[in-house]
């Protein structure tokens, strides 16, 4: 049974050229966490963290993806493109997957705030 | 407290392969992962390749696939290491390793270090 | 694969000197350095990871720091245990690669 839930940074806002964290974290469960993907709303992968190999973020996103913080991404040199849904999906075992979505909202303003609370989606 | 304890040095013939031992013990040995170093020359070190002794997962160094083969028997907390067709290049010092923790790739213990000589 | 390139190779100080050990990744590793002491006939012992985070029961005596590509292990007041050899390892993501070494002898 599948008793842990996923807590994310929720809907987030920043402004454009700026940067972000992506954060998730898992709770309520015993189950050892695998891996962790991040991937956009097209459902690109944009980077991995597994247990035993580390990171890799993809190329294509090199130049604006950081690891970190912990099991976190962040987010670079923000455009309007990256405005969308973002997810991190738990691999863990013995549970199996969990998914936690972010919504991003990147503005042009320059009195944009980053704004950021952790929900259970 | 954390132990890795190799197998003794060996003298071994060139075309010659070979199974270097590390026990492990003061931890559950399926819940961390082992890795292999290679210390040529008493300088450089090389990373070989890991094993998950939970599910006998592996990854190698591309350098190391068809010369090293990992294995582990969770029945005596042993992980394994088999050295193919050894030649003067092999000659070296091998360590187990086991990382710090999950997600924390360093390597916080290490084996005393095996010593193997190829010659004929 | 990443290369990780140690400066010097060697060098000579005194007991109470302070010395400095770099290690440059060819690529950018963010934070994810870890740095060893190994001494004659003995296994690699881990010194510092995170670039700068101390390993329990090293003496404060050692700190890391650096980040992206760039990274140094400062030893103040040099006392007669710290001679060995030093290694930098990058933990960002396999294969792990190592520097070549540091070799540091008592003057």
């Known amino acids: 049974m599948m008793t842990g839930t996923i807590e994310t940074t929720g809907n987030i806002s920043a402004k454009k050229g700026g940067s972000v964290i992506l954060q998730c974290h898992l709770s309520s469960t015993m189950a050892q966490v695998t891996q962790v993907n991040w991937e956009q709303h097209d459902h690109s992968l944009l980077a991995i963290r597994n247990a035993e190999l580390g990171w890799h973020i993809y190329p294509a996103f090199k130049d604006r993806v950081a690891p970190g913080p912990g099991l976190g991404l962040t987010l670079q040199s923000l455009t309007m493109n990256d405005t969308g849904e973002y997810f991190c999906t738990y691999h863990t075992y013995p549970d199996g997957t969990y998914r936690g979505r972010i919504f991003l909202e990147v503005l042009e303003s320059s009195v944009a705030e980053h704004s950021a609370r952790f929900q259970i989606p | 407290e954390v132990k890795l304890v190799e197998s003794g040095p060996e003298l071994v013939k060139p075309g010659a392969s070979m199974k270097i031992s590390c026990k492990a013990s003061?931890?559950?040995?399926?819940?961390?992962?082992m890795n292999w170093v290679k210390q040529s020359h008493g300088k450089n070190l090389e990373w070989i390749g890991l094993i998950n002794p939970y599910n006998g997962g592996t990854s190698y160094n591309q350098k190391f696939k068809g010369k090293a083969t990992l294995t582990v028997d969770k029945s005596s907390s042993t992980a394994y290491m088999e050295l193919l067709s050894l030649t003067s290049e092999d000659s070296a010092v091998y360590y187990c390793?086991?990382?710090?923790?999950?997600?924390?790739?360093?390597?916080?213990?290490w084996g005393q270090g095996t010593l193997v000589t190829v010659s004929s | 694969d990443i290369q990780m390139t140690q400066s010097p190779a060697s060098l000579s100080a005194s007991v109470g000197e302070t010395v400095t050990i770099t290690c440059r990744a060819s690529?950018?590793?963010?934070?994810?350095l870890a740095w060893y002491q190994q001494k004659q006939g003995k296994s690699p012992q881990l010194l510092v990871y995170n670039a700068k985070t101390l390993a329990e029961g090293v003496p404060s005596r050692f700190s890391g720091s650096g980040s992206g590509t760039q990274f140094s292990l400062k030893i103040n007041s040099l006392q007669p245990e710290d001679f060995g050899s030093y290694y930098c390892?990058?933990?960002?993501?396999?294969?792990?690669?190592f520097g070549g070494g540091t070799k540091l002898e008592i003057k």
């Open positions: 003061g931890y559950s040995f399926t819940g961390y992962t």
């Open positions: 390793a086991r990382y710090a923790n999950r997600f924390e790739n360093w390597f916080a213990y």
């Open positions: 690529e950018n590793i963010y934070s994810y």
């Open positions: 390892q990058h933990h960002y993501g396999t294969p792990w690669t």
